[in-house]
């Protein structure tokens, strides 16, 4: 249905990392514009990105209001220059997105190893607790604030000259690993939410090796 000179959006796709959430769709508009609406299951639809020629819409501000809700977005198509025009059903043409539950589906961003400190045969490795766009009491929450114990980090580490890798996990953002004195180690971290069925793991952090500037060494 719809007017003959508009086409419905298709391939509606959620792109979300650490709750920064953008809806993308096709096609690039030809003589038409789009408006996006988003709602939880309450059906209280909120309009965003009014009459845009873009094929993406940043919906972060809406989903961060409650990241555990399930959202649906819909993209309306209107003839350019005649946005009051409607389809044959008396309503503009539109298409629904897939359902999206940010808490369960947002991709975990690439972690960063903030620091490491060697004391004798122990190395304390700290992963940066990234800030998200989720707010509480006017303060931006960190990834740990949002996910709590649902979020773990895995550290992969190895002797600089070797191929054998070891792993360690933590429910905080810090690791304490055993190393050999006088031997240089390299490591990277990965964020993981074990309870998830999709998007369980982040990409790997950049590799850091002992002897680089982030490290501190004490006897």
């Amino acid at each position: 249905s719809g007017t003959t000179n508009t086409v419905a959006a298709y391939n509606l796709t959620w792109k979300s990392t650490n709750f920064k959430t953008i809806l993308e769709w096709e096609p690039k508009p030809v003589n038409q514009v789009y408006t996006v609406q988003i709602s939880t299951k309450s059906g209280d639809w909120k309009s965003k990105c009014f009459y845009t020629t873009d094929t993406e819409c940043d919906l972060t501000d809406e989903i961060v209001k409650d990241v555990k809700q399930t959202y649906l977005a819909r993209v309306f198509s209107y003839p350019a220059g005649n946005v009051e025009s409607t389809g044959s059903a008396g309503e503009p043409l539109y298409e629904n997105s897939p359902e999206f539950t940010p808490y369960l589906e947002t991709n975990l961003g690439q972690p960063t190893i903030q620091s490491f400190e060697q004391v004798g045969t122990k190395v304390n490795v700290t992963v940066e607790d990234e800030r998200t766009l989720v707010r509480r009491n006017n303060t931006f929450l960190s990834l740990r604030d949002v996910f709590g114990k649902d979020l773990i980090y895995t550290l992969y580490y190895w002797k600089d000259s070797s191929t054998g890798r070891k792993t360690n996990t933590t429910h905080t953002n810090e690791f304490l690993i055993d190393v050999e004195k006088g031997v240089s180690y390299c490591f990277f971290a990965q964020a993981v939410i074990p309870s998830r069925t999709v998007n369980r793991k982040s990409t790997d952090s950049p590799v850091e090796c002992m002897g680089q500037e982030k490290g501190e060494f004490r006897e």
């Epitope: 419905a8 299951k41 309450s42 059906g43 639809w45 008396g90």
Partner: antibody, heavy 118, light 107 residues
Framework: EVQLLESGGGLVQPGGSLRLSCAAS????????MSWVRQAPGKGLEWVSS????????YYTDSVKGRFTISRDNSKNTLYLQMNSLRAEDTAVYYC???????????WGQGTLVTVSS | DIQMTQSPPSLSASAGDRVTITCRAS??????LAWYQQKPEKAPKSLIY???SLQSGVPSRFSGSGSGTDFTLTISSLQPEDFATYYC?????????FGQGTKLEIK
């Protein structure tokens, strides 16, 4: 477990009024749009009205516009349908249903019978 | 208003049969279609939404397909408890409308 329990049905004369209630439990009521659907004796299903979770948006089928009013009290987890100027053709079992996004109907009550007759 | 036409109006089948019910919309509704099952003197029960998504708790022998104007509900292997009336519903635009129903009877 989602439970929806309708009440308020009964026999009413043409031109009369009735208020149906639907008590909801087992889910966060304000997080869902809700709907009323009716079924005349021996007939199929007919959508009557829907309301958003906040109560800000309401929708009606043409045949009841101006006569029926859907509302909700989220503090009481209750959905209502105020029916005025009732007609014989409003005779039906009225079902309350949960309606994610105001779209489909994923959970239904057992229904309450409204009979409009003199 | 969008008219929904179901076929056949009634259908006789045996346990174990594969059954298909069709629903046609008078205009395109994308995938905004749901299917319900209703047994005598009972409330309807949701089976399928978004044309092909199975409602939680519904057996996998039920499946839905279609987009635009033509939709099907398939029961892959009929069980005794599946004999009931089935309705489709469009939620593309208000007023939402149902098909007239398909009564599935035991042969």
């Amino acid at each position: 477990e989602v439970q929806l329990l309708e009440s308020g049905g009964g026999l009413v004369q043409p031109g009369g009024s009735l208020r149906l209630s639907c008590a909801a439990s087992g889910f966060t009521f304000s997080n869902y749009a809700m709907s009323w659907v009716r079924q005349a004796p021996g007939k199929g299903l007919e959508w009557v009205s829907s309301i958003s979770g906040s109560g800000d948006y309401t929708y009606y089928t043409d045949s009841v516009k101006g006569r029926f009013t859907i509302s909700r009290d989220n503090s009481k987890n209750t959905l209502y349908l105020q029916m005025n100027s009732l007609r014989a053709e409003d005779t039906a079992v009225y079902y309350c249903a949960r309606s994610p996004w105001g779209y489909y109907l994923d959970s239904w009550g057992q229904g309450t019978l409204v009979t409009v007759s003199s | 208003d969008i008219q929904m036409t179901q076929s056949p109006p009634s259908l006789s089948a045996s346990a174990g049969d594969r059954v298909t019910i069709t629903c046609r919309a008078s205009q395109g509704i994308s995938s905004r279609l749901a299917w319900y099952q209703q047994k005598p003197e009972k409330a309807p029960k949701s089976l399928i939404y978004a044309a092909s998504s199975l409602q939680s708790g519904v057996p996998s022998r039920f499946s839905g397909s279609g987009s635009g104007t033509d939709f099907t509900l398939t029961i892959s292997s009929l069980q005794p408890e599946d004999f009931a009336t089935y309705y489709c519903q469009q939620y593309n635009s208000y007023p939402y409308t149902f098909g007239q129903g398909t009564k599935l009877e035991i042969k």
